[in-house]
């Protein structure tokens, strides 16, 4: 008595896969494995499957049913943020080869990184051109103002509406200022938040607002507060620059803008006798505070010019280094104030139409706007690589 | 409360042009794709167009294509269906609807009736 | 164009007991992740109203009562126990592609 196996029905392939290797017949212990095309993968019901092989069972059935051959789907591609995603292929498609466009929020944003285009690959991701997996990055549109020039604090004149939206007022023990950077940092000066650099949550942080007493301004509060580590407290005020990271990203609008940081470019507007512009709620001509945010435009003194003005007592010699720049008329009458410490000296860059920061308030003359003496400012161009790696490390 | 609101329908010699607005309010406007969909009357639901986000892309029912455009006005918060050379069988109730991946918000409908 | 056939065209159901709509489309709607199959209830003189998106996925604030199923080109939908507010019309649709089409539409009566 002799019995032969069963031969098992031909394999089928599913729509968009092939049987490997293909046989005239299959009998007992025959095998074949299913290969979907490039970008579909195996589906047992709904699991997915990372091969598949059935074998020919001597009842002449197969062990195991046939899978399927789906489409590859990358899902709902992420939120960007300050940003929006767009289907180009079709509402909703996040199949295979569909394409999708990020873009970054207009006026305020530009998208770094790549063109915002990405295609749901056969891997199951959605890939940028360049080939990355990860989203784009809307960064925020730094040093638009609503002041085209400087016309013509202490001497100044009231502020309005976007003329200085990255203006920020610092209040925990003193009045101080800073100068938004991106989207959650602020740059001041280290005198200013010294005695906060333990105990950064006690900084009250306020933007998008004129009035120094307004119940109507963003909040923001403080995570870390970075100091230079060159700054000596009480002994001088080189490098006096320090950096406020913000616990949350503030929403950019035409009130809160952040400055930009000088390019390598920058000194050529930054010149002897070029015109800067301070702004805060510093002291005024009344000895005041501001009520109103106020401004100053102000001109860069010569350095040895400056150097020489604080040789002299009560001053050590020494006082201004190369870390300093000096702004105000010789004449006297227009300088920053005690309250303004820690705000931002801009200047326009004629080439891209956008402000930068080139100094940080940080000291002077006992008497402000006093004739013969400057109001001094942190060189923040000299502070670059220290700005950028605090930024990229944390 | 996410709400959208048609206006803009009424009664339209054939050949004619209308255009409907869909008020968009309580979601952010900008970072939704949109529809227009209609229903004749006592029949089903027939999707008519569809505009991504941010203006991107559009994408129409071949019993519409060249005849109506959707566009969107996102600081505005408004969607809208300019249809020109009306027929008689584009008759119907005309729902603004949200959603990329379904629909998932419906406006309360405006109504076209396309007759001399 | 994907095809969308509902069945049955009405159905009466006595409260309590169960109500069975099914959908067949012309070619798959499913991908690896999704299914791309969808139910609304209208009610007269008003919008559709999202139930289930994505084949099975409940939209918040809809009863529990109603459930979805199904892949590739069959899917149910199911309400259990049918309640009197449920008298409306079903519709299925897909956004497997443009033009997104919905089904002919079932009318649910409650005896």
């Known amino acids: 008595y002799t019995s032969t196996a069963q031969p098992c029905p031909y394999p089928m392939a599913p729509p968009n896969g092939h049987v490997s290797p293909v046989q005239a017949k299959y009998i007992l212990k025959d095998s074949f494995s299913i290969f979907c095309e490039t970008g579909y993968e195996l589906l047992q019901g709904h699991l997915p499957l990372k091969s598949f092989t059935a074998v020919c069972q001597k009842d002449g059935s197969w062990d195991r049913p046939m899978p399927a051959c789906s489409i590859v789907d990358c899902g709902p591609p992420d939120d960007l943020p300050s940003g929006r995603v767009e289907y180009i292929t079709g509402p909703g498609v996040t199949t295979y080869k569909a394409v999708i466009q990020y873009s970054c929020e207009e006026t305020f944003y530009t998208m770094k990184v790549n063109d915002g285009k990405y295609v749901c690959e056969a891997d199951g991701f959605w890939t940028s051109s360049k080939g990355e997996k990860s989203l784009p990055v809307c960064e925020p549109v730094c040093g638009l103002s609503a002041r085209t020039t400087g016309g013509r604090i202490y001497g100044g004149q009231k502020a309005k509406p976007g003329d200085f939206p990255w203006q920020v007022l610092i209040l925990g023990g003193t009045t101080a200022a800073g100068a938004l950077l991106y989207d959650n940092w602020v740059l001041t000066a280290a005198h200013a938040v010294y005695e906060q650099k333990h105990d950064a949550s006690a900084l009250d942080i306020r933007m998008g607002t004129l009035k120094r007493l307004s119940p109507h301004y963003t909040q923001a509060w403080s995570e870390a507060v970075f100091i230079h580590e060159g700054y000596t407290h009480d002994a001088g005020f080189d490098n006096d620059i320090a950096l406020i990271k913000l616990n949350n990203k503030v929403v950019i609008n035409s009130n809160i803008t952040p400055i930009c940081l000088p390019r390598k470019e920058a000194e050529s507007f930054m010149r002897t006798d070029d015109i800067g512009t301070a702004s805060g709620w510093g002291l005024t001509q009344r000895g005041f505070l501001a009520r109103n945010l106020m401004y100053v435009d102000i001109p860069i003194v010569d350095h040895q010019k400056c150097t020489a003005a604080y040789e002299k007592p009560p001053y050590p010699r020494g006082s201004v280094t190369a870390n300093m720049l000096c702004a105000g008329l010789e004449s006297g009458g227009k300088d920053s104030c005690r309250g303004d410490s820690g705000g931002a000296l801009v200047f326009l860059d004629s080439e891209t139409e956008r402000w930068f920061v080139g100094g940080i308030v940080s000291w002077g003359s006992m008497n402000c706007g006093e004739a013969g003496q400057y109001g001094v400012y942190t060189k923040v161009i000299n502070y670059i690589p220290w700005i950028e790696n605090i930024i990229s490390d944390f | 409360d996410v709400q959208l609101v048609e206006s803009g329908g009424g009664l339209v010699q054939p050949g004619g042009s209308r255009k409907l607005s869909c008020a968009a309010s309580?979601?952010?406007?900008?970072?939704?794709?949109m529809h227009w969909v209609r229903q004749a009357p006592e029949k089903g639901l027939e999707w008519v167009a569809y505009?991504?986000?941010?203006?991107?892309?559009?994408f129409y029912a071949d019993t519409v294509k060249g005849r109506f455009t959707i566009s969107r006005d996102n600081p505005k918060n408004t969607l809208f269906l300019q249809m020109t050379s009306l027929r008689s069988e584009d008759t119907a109730m005309y729902y603004c609807?949200?959603?990329?991946?379904?629909?998932?918000?419906w406006g309360a409908g405006t109504t076209v009736t396309v007759s001399s | 164009d994907i095809v969308l056939t509902q069945s049955p065209a009405s159905l009466a159901v006595s409260l309590g007991q169960r109500a069975t709509i099914s959908c067949r489309a012309s070619?798959?709607?499913?991908?690896?992740?999704?299914?791309?199959m969808h139910w609304f209830q209208q009610k007269p003189g008003q919008p559709p109203n999202l139930l289930i998106k994505h084949a099975s996925n409940l939209e918040s604030g809809v009863p529990a009562r109603f459930s979805g199923s199904g892949s590739g080109t069959d899917f149910t939908l199911n309400i259990h126990p049918v309640e009197e507010d449920d008298t409306a019309t079903y519709y299925c649709?897909?956004?497997?592609?443009?033009?997104?089409?919905f089904g002919g539409g079932t009318k649910l009566e409650i005896k």
């Open positions: 609807a949200r959603g990329d991946r379904n629909f998932d918000v």
């Open positions: 649709q897909h956004s497997w592609e443009v033009p997104w089409t």
């Open positions: 505009i991504s986000s941010g203006s991107s892309s559009f």
């Open positions: 070619q798959s709607v499913t991908s690896s992740r999704y299914s791309y």
């Open positions: 309580g979601f952010t406007f900008s970072s939704f794709g």
